[in-house]
Interface confidence: medium
């Protein structure tokens, strides 16, 4: 039986009975928040072989192993993930081992096993046999390995039953529990699965099979399942569904949406049966099962019941996400906020049309209006008193309206009003008059030339770069020395730089008045010698990366005809030199015959240039006889199992401090103090843990039904 669309078992362990007849869970499986320790021995679900999404276990008291519950769980497909993970085991207080001894494949996603105070047999599982890449796995805060004394079957009797693999240069036996080995297929099978008797399965099988080389005997399918057969692609007139099986049109038409009774039914798009048209597509009929592309972003009209929508926080802006036409008036009043410019762009950046007026007042957090990056029409159907449809009042840090070289904005009806915007140059306002077609509509007092731009460098001269030199992680630039009318008014220069993959950045991108700024800033003092051109060495840059750079002169607030003079450069785009790439990731090797090795890897995370080829080197190594002489009984006495507290053992997260030879004598030194990079990595690690935990809690704690 296929169960779904996701099973959530919480509070009462007897709900597990819902899994009784499931062979495949089409969706996720949550088992969580069972606070009373129960005896799970009577619960066993041998039919369950596949979970198409993810498995999440959280705070289930009394459960000591998953092996008895799910003895035949073979594949977790990870079609949809829980925060990038296909298997999450979190805060399972009594879990002693995972024990999923038939788990052979996690098709997509990583694993997260964290804060399980009594959990052992983690170092004995070779996850690389189950997952394609193990680099994203997160296994921390469990019982420290040295307190576990994990023994694989037969090792105490010197008759080891399990096979060995190498993990982190440690060649050891692989098992799930004290009596269950980790299954490995013969190298002759390559990437194929195998039967219990080590015969190779059909290439379309995944995980395991009941008979060799037979596409109807698979436990799970590598690609798709259709009419009892594993197939590489869905046959004609059938459609991919939930990432694992093929269904016909009638099946797709008959699915009731689990998520919304308002759904108009599933659609067929690009060979797949799905709940809704994907982003950028729209149904071609209310009864239609087919999608057609939208022209541009799919239009969405949003309307405010009270006619005027006040944007005074990110939360209020969030209501406008995806809107392309706003029916009503926008009142923007952003006094403070964190990373406000990019948040506003995220939520309001698709708005193209406002049917009423736009009013921006007391928005001291705004430096630019570029977050309304698609606004092209203000209809002015409703206007403020005085017939204003664009009104900008008292915004202490507003410096730019839009980048008028790349912006067409029309104000169909109504006038503009600007007052008390001390950093907004009048020339910027005049430019807006021309672009928007409002020139001639405003009366004299509508654009105040005394209190707009009174604290800005409005009459800007252009600074010219004179030289640029690059290396793999440095850029040296110099520019002409700026000479204002009175040399004493020049204080210093500020260099702004940031990564810019495309040549489309503006000075105000991601910038707000509350400290958020996507630009890095460096102050440059004036060279003491008046004939030396100012310059700077930017270091710590990434190789083979394009940067945008511009320079501003910092001048005294010297008033000349009501305004301050200043200077800045155009934005310069410059790429650092290529460098040696970082190491290739996830290197795997397997032998498929007595004379061949297959080596597979993923590209480096930092190519640092255009990769043109890889160099593969290999050498023959003598067999290590020690491996055969190793005797488990000669190990140090296995430590008594102390109950761990589930907090994270620093040793697990960071490697043990290395002892080094000091001076001429052999003796251990103290561990070196942590570098800034290590401290930063630890900080990020802690932050990442918090983010995940918040995500987990937000996802699973829901209000009780009424």
């Amino acid at each position: 039986e296929i169960c779904g669309p996701g099973i959530d078992i919480r509070n009462d362990y007897q709900q597990l009975k819902r899994l009784e007849n499931c062979t495949v869970i089409e969706g996720y499986l949550h088992i969580l928040l069972i606070s009373k320790a129960e005896d799970y021995r009577s619960y066993r679900f041998p039919k369950l072989t596949v979970i198409t999404e993810y498995l999440l276990l959280f705070r289930v008291a009394g459960l000591e192993s998953l092996g008895d519950l799910f003895p035949n769980l073979t594949v977790i497909r990870g079609w949809k993930l829980f925060y990038n993970y296909a298997l999450v085991i979190f805060e399972m207080t009594n879990l002693k081992d995972i024990g999923l001894y038939n788990l052979r494949n996690i098709t997509r996603g990583a694993i997260r096993i964290e804060k399980n105070a009594d959990l052992c047999y983690l170092s004995t599982v070779d996850w690389s046999l189950i997952l394609d890449a193990v680099s994203n796995n997160y296994i921390v805060g469990n019982k420290p390995p040295k307190e576990c004394g994990d023994l694989c079957p037969g090792t105490m009797e010197e008759k080891p039953m399990c096979e060995k693999t190498t993990i982190n240069n440690e060649y050891n036996y692989r098992c799930w529990t004290t009596n269950r080995c980790q299954k490995m297929c013969p190298s002759t099978c390559g990437k194929r699965a195998c039967t219990e008797n080590n015969e190779c399965c059909h290439p379309e099988c995944l995980g395991s099979c009941s008979a060799p080389d037979n596409d109807t005997a698979c436990v799970a399918c590598r690609h798709y399942y259709y009419a009892g057969v594993c197939v590489p692609a869905c046959p004609p007139n059938t459609y991919r569904f939930e990432g694992w099986r093929c269904v016909d049109r009638d099946f797709c038409a008959n699915i009731l949406s689990a998520e919304s009774s308002d759904s108009e039914g599933f659609v067929i798009h690009d060979g797949e049966c799905m709940q809704e048209c994907p982003s950028g597509f729209i149904r071609n009929g209310s009864q239609s099962m087919y999608c057609i592309p939208c022209e541009g972003p799919c239009p969405k009209v949003c309307e405010e019941e009270k006619k005027t929508k006040t944007i005074d926080s990110v939360t209020s802006a969030q209501m406008l996400q995806g809107c392309t036409i706003f029916k009503g008036n926008l009142l923007i009043n952003i006094r403070r906020g964190n990373n406000i410019a990019s948040e506003l762009e995220n939520f309001m950046g698709l708005i193209e049309v406002v049917t009423g007026y736009v009013k921006i007042r007391h928005s001291h957090a705004l430096v630019s209006l570029s977050f309304l990056k698609n606004l092209r029409l203000i209809l002015g159907e409703e206007q403020l008193e005085g017939n204003y449809s664009f009104y900008v009042l008292d915004n202490q840090n507003l410096q730019q309206l839009w980048d008028w070289d790349h912006r067409n904005l029309t104000i169909k009806a109504g006038k503009m009003y600007f007052a008390f915007n001390p950093k907004l140059c009048v020339s910027e306002i005049y430019r807006m008059e021309e672009v928007t077609g409002t020139k001639g509509r405003q009366s004299k007092g509508d654009i105040n030339t005394r209190n707009n731009g009174e604290r800005a460098s409005c009459e800007s001269d252009v600074l010219h770069f004179t030289s640029t030199t690059t290396s793999k992680n440095r850029i040296i630039i110099t520019w002409h020395r700026y000479r204002p009318p009175d040399y004493r008014d020049l204080i210093s220069f500020t260099v702004y730089y940031k990564e810019a993959p495309f040549k489309n950045v503006t000075e105000y991108d991601g910038q707000d008045a509350c400290g958020s700024n996507s630009w890095n800033m460096v102050d440059v003092d004036l060279p003491p010698n008046k004939d030396v051109e100012p310059g700077i060495l930017l270091h710590g840059l990434k190789p083979w990366t394009q940067y945008a750079v511009y320079v501003k002169a910092v001048t005294l607030t010297m008033v000349e005809n009501d305004h301050i003079r200043g200077a800045k450069s155009e934005i310069l785009y410059i790429r650092t030199n290529a460098s040696v790439p970082s190491i290739p990731l996830d290197v795997l090797s397997a032998s498929n015959s007595s004379s061949q090795l297959i080596v597979k890897w993923n590209p480096p995370s930092l190519p640092n240039g255009n990769l043109s080829y890889y160099i593969v080197r290999w050498q023959r190594q003598p067999q290590d006889g020690y491996l055969y002489r190793h005797n488990y009984c000669s190990k140090d006495k296995i430590p008594i199992r102390k109950y761990a507290d589930g907090t994270i053992d620093i040793e697990e997260v960071t490697e043990n401090p290395k002892t080094e030879v000091c001076g001429g004598e052999k003796g251990p030194c103290c561990a070196c103090p942590k570098t800034e990079a290590e401290k930063q990595a630890e900080k990020e690690e802690a932050e990442y843990r918090k983010v995940f935990e918040n995500f987990l809690h937000n996802s699973i704690f829901v209000p009780r039904p009424e």
Epitope: A253, N254, L256, S261, D262, S263, E264, G265, I282, R283, N284, G285, S286, Q287, I292, C294, E295, C298, P299, K300, V301, C302, E303, E305, I325, K327
Partner: antibody
Framework: QIQLQQPGAELVKPGASVKLSCKAP????????MHWVRQAPGQGLEWMGE????????NYAQKFQGRVTLTVDTSTSTAYMELSSLRSEDTAVYYC??????????WGQGTLVTVSS | DIQMNQSPSSLSASLGDTITITCRAS??????LSWYQQKPGKAPKLLIY???NLHTGVPSRFSGSGSGTDFTLTISSLQPEDFATYYC?????????FGGGTKLEIK
């Protein structure tokens, strides 16, 4: 509250055309298909066609194909239905209505079109 | 076109009664059936959509069931405001088609 506003009545001559409006404030106009249904005096309900305000895709009942045209103006959240070559049997109340789960959730109050010379 | 056969065409009942109206489709329409109530001179009102989902604001004495070709609307404990004409509508394939209607009258 979603409400669809339609004019009360239209009197037209046979052979002429009529263009009915349906103003749709109070909801995201482009999020729902707009349908047109008519009801002749003392008769049942008859579906004429639908349009998607977000991309102007239309689907018509075969019976009205060629005679009916559905359009929208998203800036004013108004849908229009134009019926041409009118005959006396087109005398009916014409409703605009928006969809929900392939049903018609909200209805205008209807426009009575009388075709008479 | 899919034909919708609604029965009975008229029905008399008393306050507090439970009544059932049926709608039969000429072919499988899955669960794409909705029910409407119309009073004289007024626009129809949606009661049930997708065969069994109660529309917002509709009293719980209205219920719908069925799938495939046979569907029923049940009104339990009839109230004075329930006396009206009821229509079913199929949304499985174009064109949308209505049943002929059932006029519910007070006995």
């Amino acid at each position: 509250q979603i409400q669809l506003q339609q004019p009360g009545a239209e009197l037209v001559k046979p052979g002429a055309s009529v263009k009915l409006s349906c103003k749709a404030p109070g909801y995201t106009f482009t999020s729902y298909w707009m349908h047109w249904v008519r009801q002749a005096p003392g008769q049942g309900l008859e579906w004429m066609g639908e349009t998607n305000p977000s991309n102007s895709v239309t689907n018509y009942a075969q019976k009205f194909q060629g005679r009916v045209t559905l359009t929208v103006d998203t800036s004013t959240s108004t849908a229009y239905m134009e019926l041409s070559s009118l005959r006396s049997e087109d005398t009916a109340v014409y409703y605009c209505t928006i969809g929900r789960g392939r049903g018609f959730a909200y209805w205008g109050q209807g426009t009575l079109v009388t075709v008479s010379s | 076109d899919i034909q919708m056969n609604q029965s009975p065409s008229s029905l008399s009942a008393s306050l507090g009664d439970t009544i059932t109206i049926t709608c039969r489709a000429s072919q499988n329409i899955n669960f794409w059936l909705s029910w409407y109530q119309q009073k004289p001179g007024k626009a129809p009102k949606l009661l049930i959509y997708k065969a069994s989902n109660l529309h917002t604001g509709v009293p719980s004495r209205f219920s719908g069931s069925g799938s495939g070709t046979d569907f029923t609307l049940t009104i339990s404990s009839l109230q004075p405001e329930d006396f009206a004409t009821y229509y079913c509508l199929q949304g499985q394939s174009y064109p949308y088609t209505f049943g002929g209607g059932t006029k519910l009258e007070i006995k």
